[in-house]
């Protein structure tokens, strides 16, 4: 099979193919104006249009604008990718009452359970808090939910759980209009009893649940709201999210309210010098020396080859599992045969520094 022979001439004479020395394989040449979705395309569907930044290629092959999460009540759930839109959701402490494609048209604050009711299900980005009547065993002095303990599993609720209705608690479901802090503050004062993290059913230590609006007096569970592209670090400071704007980096996780953006080396590259939430230096994937492969003859590939039938015999040059750990049967400095195909197959985490040993084989840098 031509694809299994490392000979360049097998691809020549066909204008729709080219030879990639790095993977020792014939590749499909994407037509003008189309870009490969993997290092060595194998067919026309491995090519795609390239859209402008902040646009994605939809199912009809059109470049479509990614939605923006710039409204105060929204946060980015997933970033804008080449083939999918950015997805926004209501920020912590709020839920979506009117959904929109890849976003939410209207977010409301989670309701507080009224006196005599306790949280059955805490509010999420999609659903409001669900309350249920406190059990008969609970003290009638339990006037506000934050003082009430959840009933033990042995108690039977008196009625079916019900979400707090906006009709009965209009103040508690006040929508947040883009950027009006007064509305947020008003909503905050109306809907939150002092020190009431349990009103949404979680302990106050959970940072994902603290309200994002300014604190009412006496409330200890609020957090600062940072500027766009900043996050609240563990010390409670607004810290700039790292930027992945360098050509050799791609965004791995977006900038969130409580965590930085993280960057990784783009497919086909590996991190040589790590940095906090990023990589200071990306280098092209090291290619395994041909002599380190168990069966070099009749091979066009760099990844593991198996000889039939005994499975499990590992060649010298072998990718580690996807979590980057070496198999138990091998030594920690086992050489890695790196496959430079799609980013999902990288055998070494791209944030892990790699050093080349004296044999020319890459080894994980423990430092």
């Amino acid at each position: 099979f031509p694809q299994d022979r490392p000979f360049e001439d097998t691809c020549h004479g066909n204008p729709s193919h080219y030879y990639d020395k790095a993977v020792r394989r014939c590749c499909y040449r994407c037509p003008m104006g189309l870009f490969p979705t993997q290092q060595c395309p194998q067919r026309p569907t491995d090519c795609r249009k390239q859209c402008e930044p902040d646009y994605y290629l939809d199912e009809a092959d059109r470049c479509t604008a990614c939605v923006t999460c710039s409204r105060d009540d929204l946060v980015e759930k997933t970033p804008c990718a080449w083939n999918s839109s950015r997805v926004c959701e209501c920020r912590p402490g709020m839920f979506c009452s009117t959904s929109a494609v890849n976003s939410c048209a209207r977010c409301f604050f989670h309701s507080v359970c009224p006196a005599g009711m306790i949280v059955k299900f805490p509010g999420t980005a999609q659903k409001n808090t669900v309350c249920e009547p406190a059990s008969p065993g609970v003290s009638p002095a339990c006037a506000s939910p934050e003082n009430c303990k959840e009933p033990s599993s042995g108690t039977i609720p008196q009625a079916k759980p019900t979400p707090v209705s906006p009709a009965t608690s209009s103040a508690s479901t006040m929508p947040v209009r883009g950027g009006t802090r007064l509305a947020q503050e008003a909503a905050s004062k109306l809907t939150r009893a002092p020190d009431s993290p349990s009103s949404v059913g979680r302990p106050s230590s959970d940072p994902g649940l603290s309200p994002t609006q300014p604190c009412p007096e006496g409330s200890g569970d609020c957090r600062k709201q940072c500027e766009p592209d900043y996050y609240l670090d563990e010390a409670g400071r607004c810290t700039a999210c790292v930027s992945c704007s360098r050509d050799d980096l791609v965004e791995k996780t977006p900038c969130a309210w409580n965590s930085s953006r993280t960057c990784e080396c783009r497919p086909g590259m590996i991190c040589a010098t790590s940095a906090t939430n990023s990589c200071a230096r990306c280098v092209p994937y090291p290619i395994c020396a041909a002599e380190t492969v168990t069966k070099p003859q009749d091979m066009a590939e760099k990844d593991t080859t198996f000889e039939a039938p005994p499975l499990g015999t590992q060649p010298d040059c072998n990718p580690t599992p996807e979590n980057g750990e070496a198999p138990a049967s091998t030594s920690p400095t086992q050489s890695l045969l790196v496959d430079s195909q799609a980013s999902k197959t990288l055998p070494i985490p791209t944030s892990a520094p790699v050093a080349l040993s004296s044999t020319g084989k890459p080894v994980l840098d423990a430092g």
């Epitope: 694809q3 394989r25 499909y28 060595c40 194998q42 067919r43 091979m299 066009a300 590939e301 990844d303």
Partner: antibody, heavy 116, light 107 residues
Framework: QVQLQQWGAGLLKPSETLSLTCAVY????????WSWIRQPPGKGLEWIGE???????KYTPSLKSRVTISVDTSKHQFSLKLSSVTAADTAVYYC??????????WGRGTLVTVSS | EIVLTQSPATLSLSPGERATLSCRAS??????LAWYQQKPGQAPRLLIY???NRATGIPARLSGSGSGTDFTLTISSLEPEDFAVYYC?????????FGQGTKVEIK
Amino acid sequence: QVQLQQWGAGLLKPSETLSLTCAVYGGSFSGYYWSWIRQPPGKGLEWIGEINHSGSTKYTPSLKSRVTISVDTSKHQFSLKLSSVTAADTAVYYCARETVYYFDLWGRGTLVTVSS
Amino acid sequence: EIVLTQSPATLSLSPGERATLSCRASQSVSSNLAWYQQKPGQAPRLLIYDASNRATGIPARLSGSGSGTDFTLTISSLEPEDFAVYYCQQRSNWPWTFGQGTKVEIK
């Protein structure tokens, strides 16, 4: 020499799940697409679906609700599961590799018979 | 999905004769078409890819032509080993589809 070896149950009862596995020996696994194709007795070929080394799948619409293709890259294997089989699923099932040269490498085929 | 229609269904010829097999697509597939040969009890074998390129080891008497919707596989002079079923296959649009086949039999 690169080879595809496939195996799985050959006789099934209606409503059972067909399960086949294909192993790649002597060649690369990543960077290619791995398909399942079937051929009812005396009839033509039907592409069922594919997977790549990173687990990305595509299925033919007529079977999409019943078919699952999975991959085990560490073993260089990929598998087909087809649920709720009927007599119409009786066929020779082939695994195949797709490259720039289309389906350039095929397994020998496994006859799966669905009969009560 | 793209439907590939092969004609004729059966072609009865003698060794040494010329065989012309047709494959028509319901919509354009550009040149993203392959031809396969299948003998009884065997898996299909790739003959032609990208409409007109012979696969490795395929003799020069087999040739492919066409683009868009009309494709032809030609066997210039039939050898005994050429009597088999031939399928065309497209990979221009999901799902990949095959023609129903043309059987080339000895007259």
